[in-house]
C-alpha cells in the first residue's frame, strides 16, 4: 500500500550534468541545457515529484510527473519507460506499481539519487545514449557505482 | 494566513476516550500529509500519526498503535485523532502539524497545541 | 522506533559557535535527505530551522546551518545570541512502520 505524502516540483539531472525533459513525441530524454535554456523549456523540464509513504519498510516511495496540457506520469510497465496520461493516485492499493520508484541517496553521496521500480526489484531508471540521443530507460543494476543509474534533484518549487 | 486549530482537549480519566480535531485554514489541505504531534509536560517531542493525502494511509507511534486512530475529512478542512483506552503517560500538549518534508515551498505548520490531561 | 539521539545539553558564550547532533539510522537519518531541526523556546510551538539536512527556510538567519554524514545529523549555530537559548529537536522521515521520529532534544544554554 501506498499513501501520498505531498509533492514537489524538481529538475533532475543526470551526473554529466544534462537536464532531463519531455520532448514533443512525450519521450523523457536528457540534454545540456543552461539555467536559462532549463527556465525557457520549462514546463517541459519541471517535473512532480509526489511522495508516498510504502505500507512495507522499503524506503521513501516516489512518482514522477510532468505538467504540460495535462498531467503525464512515468511508467516502467514491461520494463519499457514511457509517460501515461494520468494523475498520481493519492492511494495505491498494492506493493509493486509500474509508476512507483523507490528513491534513495547513494551511500556516501547524499545529495546523488538512485529510483530503483517497485515492479522490477534491481532495476533502475539510467540514462543511457541510443545514437546522438541521451534517453531515460529502465536498467538492470550490473555494477557498484554505475553512474548512469545516479542522478541529482534540484528543488524548483 | 495558514492556521491550525486543535479543538477538544480537557481532562479525561484513565481508560477513557477523546476525540481531538484540526481545522485548517490557508493552504491545499488534501494536498498534504498530516501529523499529530505530542509533548508531555517537561519532556521532548513524540510524534504520534500521520495520515496520507486521501486518508487511505494511516501510520502510528509503537506507543499508540492499537489505540489512537488518526482520519481526515478533506471536505472540511479537518483533522482527528481519536484516542481509547487513555493512560496517564498519554497526557501531554497534542498539536497538530504539517511537518516540511521536501521541497522549497512545502511548509511548516503547527497548531497552538491542546492540553490532554489524563488523570483520575 | 527508537528515537534520534541528541545529547541533552550543550552551552556555550555569546559570539561562539556550538554543534548539536542528532544520531539515526539507515532506516531514518542514514537513508533519506529528509531531515529537519526545530528550534522551542518554553511554552511556544516548534519552529522550523533547517529541512532536508541543510536547507533553511526564508526568515531564518544564516546562522543556523546543518549538515549531514552517514546516520548522523548535525545543527550548528555561529554567533551564539542570548536569544537562541532554547531547546532543539532534530526530526527525520523514517521508512519504519511509523512516519516521522524525532530526537530526544538538546537544551542550549548561552552562558
Known amino acids: 500500500y501506498f499513501g501520498k505524502l505531498e509533492s514537489k516540483l524538481s529538475v533532475i539531472r543526470n551526473l554529466n550534468d544534462q537536464v532531463l525533459f519531455i520532448d514533443q513525441g512525450n519521450r523523457p530524454l536528457f540534454e545540456d541545457m543552461t539555467d536559462s535554456d532549463c527556465r525557457d523549456n520549462a514546463p517541459r523540464t519541471i517535473f512532480i515529484i509526489s511522495m508516498y509513504k510504502d505500507s512495507q519498510p522499503r524506503g521513501m516511495a516516489v512518482t514522477i510527473s510532468v505538467k504540460c496540457e495535462k498531467i503525464s506520469t512515468l511508467s516502467c510497465e514491461n520494463k519499457i519507460i514511457s509517460f501515461k496520461e494520468m494523475n498520481p493516485p493519492d492511494n495505491i492499493k498494492d506493493t509493486k506499481s509500474d509508476i512507483i520508484f523507490f528513491q534513495r541517496s547513494v551511500p556516501g553521496h547524499d545529495n546523488k539519487m538512485q529510483f530503483e521500480s517497485s515492479s522490477y526489484e534491481g532495476y533502475f531508471l539510467a540514462c543511457e545514449k541510443e545514437r546522438d540521443l541521451f534517453k531515460l530507460i529502465l536498467k538492470k543494476e550490473d555494477e557498484l557505482g554505475d553512474r548512469s543509474i545516479m542522478f541529482t534533484v534540484q528543488n524548483e518549487d | 494566513e495558514v492556521q491550525l486549530v486543535e479543538s477538544g482537549g480537557g481532562l479525561v480519566q484513565p481508560g477513557g476516550s477523546m476525540r481531538l480535531s484540526c481545522t485548517a485554514s490557508?493552504?491545499?489541505?488534501?494536498?498534504?500529509?498530516m501529523s499529530w504531534v505530542r509533548q508531555a509536560p517537561g519532556k521532548g517531542l513524540e510524534w504520534v500519526s500521520g495520515?496520507?493525502?486521501?486518508?487511505?494511509?494511516?501510520y502510528y507511534a509503537d506507543s499508540v498503535e492499537g489505540r489512537f486512530t488518526i482520519s481526515r475529512d478533506n471536505s472540511k478542512n479537518t483533522l482527528y485523532l481519536q484516542m481509547n483506552s487513555l493512560r496517564a503517560e498519554d497526557t501531554a500538549v497534542y498539536y497538530c502539524?504539517?511537518?516540511?518534508?521536501?521541497?522549497?515551498?512545502?511548509?511548516?505548520?503547527w497548531g497552538q497545541g491542546t492540553l490532554v490531561t489524563v488523570s483520575s | 522506533q527508537s528515537a534520534l539521539t541528541q545529547p541533552a545539553s550543550v552551552s556555550g558564550s555569546p559570539g561562539q559557535s556550538i554543534t548539536i547532533s542528532c544520531t539515526g539510522t539507515s532506516s531514518d537519518v542514514g537513508g533519506y535527505n529528509y531531515v529537519s531541526w526545530y528550534q522551542q523556546h518554553p511554552g511556544k510551538a516548534p519552529k522550523l530551522l533547517i529541512y532536508e539536512v541543510s536547507h533553511r527556510p526564508s526568515g531564518v538567519s544564516d546562522r543556523f546551518s546543518g549538515s549531514k554524514s552517514g546516520n548522523t545529523a548535525s545543527l550548528t549555530i555561529s554567533g551564539l545570541q542570548a536569544e537562541d537559548e532554547a531547546d532543539y529537536y532534530c526530526s527525520s522521515f523514517t521508512s519504519s512502520s511509523s512516519l516521522y521520529v524525532f530526537g530526544t532534544g538538546t537544551k542550549l544554554t548561552v552562558l
Open positions: 490557508g493552504f491545499t489541505f488534501d494536498e498534504y500529509a
Open positions: 495520515i496520507s493525502t486521501g486518508g487511505g494511509g494511516t
Open positions: 502539524a504539517k511537518p516540511w518534508l521536501s521541497g522549497s515551498r512545502s511548509g511548516d505548520f
